[in-house]
């Protein structure tokens, strides 16, 4: 039961995380105009990965896409790439994890296959979350660098008397959404990997003892379980390993300690 809950929770957390990564990638507010200690402009500028926007005092908002590909900073391209890779991996991970969910029965899919898929999706979620966190962090670092550069040179002189307003940008909402979403996807991935350990069939040490009843030959096989993370033999009635290393005697003495799924 605990494994199903862990797997289900991991899936939901990852789903929320990936939705957040998609939202952050699409959001326009990756960087917003810094209003502190700046000339008070009658327009508010903010920028995303795909376009820059301006909100006038009336509320009228105008956005313009970055229609060039080669003219964009390499860092911005890198951030875009990281976010897209994160989304793609996350989406594939979600697809895989749906089939890996213990509560969903698909044909006669083996538990070992589900364990494999759970681990695969977990790894994908971890990488997806890391990509998002990396992308957002690279962008944040870029902002910090530019912020201090423009602070050092608040106004750039043009022809002696004429000055141009240097718009400084600070962290936008999308960065925080991205960090949180990346973190959630990462946590979800870890949970999936943990769930996979529980789903993995245990290697069985068969010490078959034959009990002869009158006229019938019934073989009773006591469960000698070994702690294992591998995807070994495919036993139908698996016992979920619950963490403590036990002797065969202990296992036989306390069968109620194990969940039968």
């Amino acid at each position: 039961m605990a494994v199903t809950a862990c797997q289900g929770l991991g899936f939901v957390v990852s789903l929320i995380g990936i939705a957040g990564i998609i939202a952050a990638t699409c959001m326009d507010q990756w960087s917003t105009q810094d209003l502190y200690n700046n000339p008070v402009t009658a327009v508010f500028n903010y920028q995303g990965l795909w376009r820059s926007c301006v909100r006038e005092s009336s509320g009228f908002t105008e956005c313009r896409g970055y229609f060039t590909l080669l003219g964009l900073p390499a860092m911005l391209q890198a951030v875009r790439a990281l976010m897209i890779v994160g989304i793609v991996l996350g989406a594939i991970g979600l697809l895989v994890s749906i089939f890996a969910l213990k509560c969903i029965r698909i044909g006669s899919m083996e538990d070992s296959a589900k364990a494999n898929m759970t681990l695969t999706s977990g790894i994908m979620f971890i990488v997806s979350g890391l990509c998002a966190i990396a992308g957002v962090s690279v962008f944040a670092n870029m902002l910090v660098t530019n912020f201090w550069m423009s602070t050092a040179n608040m106004y750039t002189g043009m022809g002696g008397m004429v000055q141009t307003v240097q718009t400084r940008y600070t962290f936008g909402a999308a960065l925080f959404v991205g960090w949180v979403a990346g973190g959630l996807t990462l946590i979800g991935g870890v949970m999936m990997c943990i769930a996979c350990r529980g789903l993995a069939p245990e290697e069985t040490n068969y010490k078959a003892v034959s009990y002869h009843a009158s006229g019938h030959s019934v073989a009773y096989k006591p469960g000698g379980f070994k702690a294992s993370t591998g995807f070994g033999s495919n036993t139908k009635n698996k016992k979920i390993y619950d963490g403590g290393a036990r002797t065969e005697d202990e296992v036989q003495s306390y069968p109620s300690k194990h969940d039968y799924v």
Partner: antibody, heavy 119, light 113 residues
Framework: EVQLVESGGGLVQPGGSLRLSCAVS????????MHWVRQAPGKGLEWVAY????????YYADSVKGRFTVSRDNAKNSLYLQMNSLRAEDTAVYYC????????????WGQGTLVTVSS | DIVMTQSPDSLAVSLGERVTMNCKSS????????????LTWYQQKPGQPPKLLIY???TRESGVPDRFSGSGSGTDFTLTISSVQAEDVAVYYC?????????FGQGTKLEIK
Amino acid sequence: EVQLVESGGGLVQPGGSLRLSCAVSGFTFSSFGMHWVRQAPGKGLEWVAYISSGTTNIYYADSVKGRFTVSRDNAKNSLYLQMNSLRAEDTAVYYCVRSGYYGNSLDYWGQGTLVTVSS
Amino acid sequence: DIVMTQSPDSLAVSLGERVTMNCKSSQSLFNSGNQRNYLTWYQQKPGQPPKLLIYWASTRESGVPDRFSGSGSGTDFTLTISSVQAEDVAVYYCQNVYIYPLTFGQGTKLEIK
């Protein structure tokens, strides 16, 4: 039809106070920022103050900062300018102006109300 | 504060003539975010309140005759009347609508010869 009607102008002594009002009709007042602009007799235009639609942003010209207060009552479709510590140089026609939807322009102007500061 | 300087202070032209007036700002009014210049032009006829002519330095307000056009970018702007009519006699003001406090130029008075 958009209409802006200023009132409350008149003769006041230096150091005195006056409250100008602007009654608005013909548009959704609560959706637009509003400005006060003044024009001294025979002189050019001088921007005085701005108040955003939801009163979040209020800005003043340096010459009136600390003496003038702009406010609005969206329920009454009214804009106000409270003028304290009036000086002779505040003598002007005061216009109530709507902030346009595009380009931060000042698109509709009232006829103005004359404020004379004299002893 | 941004200082707006208009030139000339006044000009007298014949009907049908082309006229240009200039406006210079002490700081750039160009916003890179949307590639727009936040400069507005107004016309004030004698005894009347000002009337909006042009915003974003070159966009005509609806109802404004197409003989009026605005141009320029950054710090230098121009208002052009392609063929002056009698009703164009007025004072023309430019305004910074980019940085508070918003500031007006001193105006250019247009007269007919």
